[in-house]
Interface confidence: medium
Amino acid sequence: GALEVQVPEDPVVALVGTDATLCCSFSPEPGFSLAQLNLIWQLTDTKQLVHSFAEGQDQGSAYANRTALFPDLLAQGNASLRLQRVRVADEGSFTCFVSIRDFGSAAVSLQVAAPYSKPSMTLEPNKDLRPGDTVTITCSSYQGYPEAEVFWQDGQGVPLTGNVTTSQMANEQGLFDVHSILRVVLGANGTYSCLVRNPVLQQDAHSSVTITPQRSPTGAVEVQVPEDPVVALVGTDATLRCSFSPEPGFSLAQLNLIWQLTDTKQLVHSFTEGRDQGSAYANRTALFPDLLAQGNASLRLQRVRVADEGSFTCFVSIRDFGSAAVSLQVAAPYSKPSMTLEPNKDLRPGDTVTITCSSYRGYPEAEVFWQDGQGVPLTGNVTTSQMANEQGLFDVHSVLRVVLGANGTYSCLVRNPVLQQDAHGSVTITGQPMTFPPEA
């Protein structure tokens, strides 16, 4: 006699500041009218009222005025709740109570998340370093949720676990800043990488620092650039680091500095005859004039585009000459995939359905993986297309054709291979016959 109320088994993951839909549905009988419906959403633990519908009317939000029902869909059995401008404090379980003649309820979990920023790396001390010196490397990443996992590794990918201290500090919005400190004794040179992982979003943010202690005396100017590509997000600014060691008495009048594209030799930026000659590259480059005298020949590239990807060479000439090339790897995160189902109503076991997973405006091309609710990869009957727009960003559409069982969950994971960012969506098909989507 009880009313069957259906909610997703998996937690609903929502990014801080976005809107989330907590899906809840019931099967109205023929002749059902909204006047018969009593619908209550409440916090499962505290029983605090969140939203209600009674006596044929939406009784409104009792939860900071940030909730709404889908009034046009209630008559079809869609009792889903829209929660606006999600906050960390919203995380938890919400219960959907539906009463017509019979009564039923089910609880849905909301998991809140916020991506961590790309870590910033600092070094102390940061000059006159020699092999054998102990240095403190700090990796800081900001405003994520929930607490991060932090991993350090050396240039060979070997984990560094000793002498690491990590603190995570929650701000007033409940978001965490993570500061991880590694103390190491320098070898001849070394790369140290810090990876900050959001365990819910499976988002990895990483940065690395390469330390080359005091140069050996040679005839040529030793020009130092990072070994690893500089990864820059589309639309942000990137610094292509390049440094040299000025000798005592060095003056900028002696310096000739040229940045150019490694392959085409196209001039990008130059400093000659004691002055900055400016950008020859779409007016989007700049040096750090205050730092040149200390040997910092780095180039700032503004509003990075996909077309900027490639190798840039830094030529430094004083009395002697030296050069080195640094790679720019451009990236853009993929959006959370949207999932669609065709056909999307009156589905029964044995029906063939087409599930489309679409994720937008990422770079470079994504890797797409499908799996079922047990985590078993689904590789047959998958077609994936990736289309670049005029900015060079890719929209990915992956189509899976499956024969329905009694019920099933189908997950699509879109991975950005450079950012190691995973964006995933899933659809659960239960009950028969049923209609998709169960939310608005």
């Epitope: 102390e124 403190t136 900001y142 405003q143 603190s167």
Partner: antibody
Framework: QVQLQQPGAELVKPGASVKLSCKAS????????MHWVKQRPGQGLEWIGM????????NYNEKFKGKGTLTVDKSSSTAYMQLSSLTSDDSAVYYC??????????WGQGTLVTVSA | ENVLTQSPAIMSVSPGEKVTMTCRAS???????LHWYQQKSGASPKFWIY???NLASGVPARFSGSGSGTSYSLTISSVEAEDAATYYC?????????FGAGTKLELR
């Protein structure tokens, strides 16, 4: 090298507001938190709050909520703190400080705010 | 909030003496996140010691720092005239960030 430039002094009337500026150079402004610290004459240091120039995200010391509002102008690499409803208790030197790690390596010269009728 | 209590508030010493000042936290602080600053009269504070025991660039080797948990100290092995200043400890292990009230070092 890293530099944080602040005006030397501001004289303001009780009840008024003042907007303090801090112009940053010599580093990537958008990559690191900018903090503000208060020091009353002959007294210690008090942390007011911090702002991340890239996201605009802020953290405030509860004690200074409603007193100080932090903003940035990325285009000019300048951080601002607006102090409102000023009283004699707000007469102090205000420092901007950038933390590129968990310590405060770079301090501005400070702006002396004097609240007087 | 984590309250840092510095003692003594003022100390008066002669050049060449060894001095130690302490900083006690109301809650435990990881040694990586406890730092010290020096401030001379009329000047901005200067970054002095980081992560309990590491000297910032340009800080003389007569300075040292130590401690763990809730108890930290800054020591000057042989005080010189230029060390006259106020020294502040600070933690970065939870909001709000706090400073100690300072120890003023005067030279006789």
């Amino acid at each position: 090298q890293v530099q944080l430039q602040q005006p030397g002094a501001e004289l303001v009337k009780p009840g008024a507001s003042v907007k303090l500026s801090c112009k940053a150079s010599g580093y990537t402004f958008t990559s690191y938190w900018m903090h503000w610290v208060k020091q009353r004459p002959g007294q210690g240091l008090e942390w007011i709050g911090m702002i991340h120039p890239n996201s605009g995200g802020t953290n405030y010391n509860e004690k200074f909520k409603g007193k100080g509002t932090l903003t940035v102008d990325k285009s000019s690499s300048t951080a601002y703190m607006q102090l409102s409803s000023l009283t004699s208790d707000d007469s102090a030197v205000y420092y901007c400080v950038t933390s590129q790690a968990t310590w405060f390596a770079y301090w501005g010269q400070g702006t002396l705010v004097t609240v007087s009728a | 909030e984590n309250v840092l209590t510095q003692s003594p508030a003022i100390m008066s010493v002669s050049p060449g003496e060894k001095v130690t000042m302490t900083c006690r936290a109301s809650s435990s602080v990881s040694s990586s996140y406890l730092h010290w600053y020096q401030q001379k009269s009329g000047a901005s504070p200067k970054f002095w010691i980081y992560s309990t025991s590491n000297l910032a660039s340009g800080v003389p080797a007569r300075f040292s720092g130590s401690g763990s948990g809730t108890s930290y100290s800054l020591t000057i092995s042989s005080v010189e005239a230029e060390d006259a200043a106020t020294y502040y400890c600070q933690h970065y292990s939870g909001y709000p960030l706090t400073f100690g009230a300072g120890t003023k070092l005067e030279l006789r």
